[in-house]
């Protein structure tokens, strides 16, 4: 069964940068990755961040910068300008369409006693849906 | 509960020029639509797909507005624009916006899988 794993780290040098790292595990191809914020994509979540393979990347503030690491992995960074670090407390979720078994998502958030630079172990999270 | 509303429609003289509106909102979250079009349905007739316009930026333009027509998008994803310029009188219609997701971010063939629609706005083309 096909699945995806979230990752949210904090920069070490930076403490209002975070990182957010996503990726898929199972067979097929991946045609649209979308990272969204506050829940999941379509129910409640904003859009940060959507990564096609052909068609390009678009992303919104707050996120800075969305990128492929690889075939089925991306990282979104992202910066968080205000004074306190709401990002610490906010879910993080990508969905992966991947053709031909639909699509699937998870979410994680910044682990409550993670020290800046660590991040939260990649375990495959499977939740919600599988389109 | 996800909300579009136009806005521009009006009485313009054939050959003139209008520019319609359609903003996407949502409570409690920003709606960043994969796919947003715009429609039209002149009086005593169905419905069609006039423009649409990816996420990324991908448009798609029915036949008898290509050329006449420019569908544009914000940066911050929640807006849809139509610019209509060399009006003629067939194109008196009202306009609806209508927005959705897809599996890959483009937009679907026009008229499929847009599951929020706006009230409409009146375009009028006459001298």
């Known amino acids: 069964t096909p699945e995806v794993w979230v990752q949210v780290q904090m920069e070490a040098t930076e403490l209002s940068s975070f990182t957010v790292h996503c990726g898929f595990l199972g067979p097929g191809s991946i045609s649209l990755v979308t990272v969204s914020w506050g829940g999941p994509d379509g129910a409640g979540g904003t859009k940060l961040a959507v990564l096609h393979p052909e068609l390009g990347t678009r992303q919104w503030a707050p996120a800075r910068q969305a990128r492929w690491e690889t075939q089925s992995s991306i990282s979104l960074a992202l910066e968080d300008s205000g004074a306190s670090s709401p990002f610490a407390n906010t879910t993080f979720c990508c969905k992966f369409a991947s053709f031909p078994e639909g699509s699937w998502e998870s979410c994680g958030s910044l682990p409550p006693s993670s020290d800046p630079g660590l991040s939260a172990p990649p375990t495959p999270v499977p939740i919600l849906r599988a389109d | 509960h996800v909300q579009l509303v136009e806005s521009g429609g009006g009485l313009v003289q054939p050959g003139g020029s209008l520019r319609l509106s359609c903003v996407a909102s949502?409570?409690?979250?920003?709606?960043?639509?994969?796919?947003m079009a715009w429609f039209r349905q002149a009086p005593g007739k169905e419905r069609e797909a006039v423009a649409g316009?990816?996420?990324?930026?991908?448009?798609t333009y029915a036949d008898s507005v290509k050329g006449r027509f420019t569908a544009s998008r914000d940066n911050a994803g929640f807006s849809l624009y139509l610019q209509m310029n060399s009006l003629r009188a067939e194109d008196t219609a009202v306009y609806y916006c209508?927005?959705?997701?897809?599996?890959?971010?483009?937009?679907?063939?026009?008229?499929?899988?847009?599951?929020?629609w706006g009230q409409g706005t009146m375009v009028t083309v006459s001298s």
């Open positions: 209508a927005a959705g997701d897809s599996p890959d971010g483009r937009c679907p063939p026009l008229g499929q899988g847009l599951n929020y």
């Open positions: 316009i990816d996420i990324f930026g991908g448009t």
């Open positions: 949502a409570s409690g979250f920003t709606y960043r639509p994969y796919c």
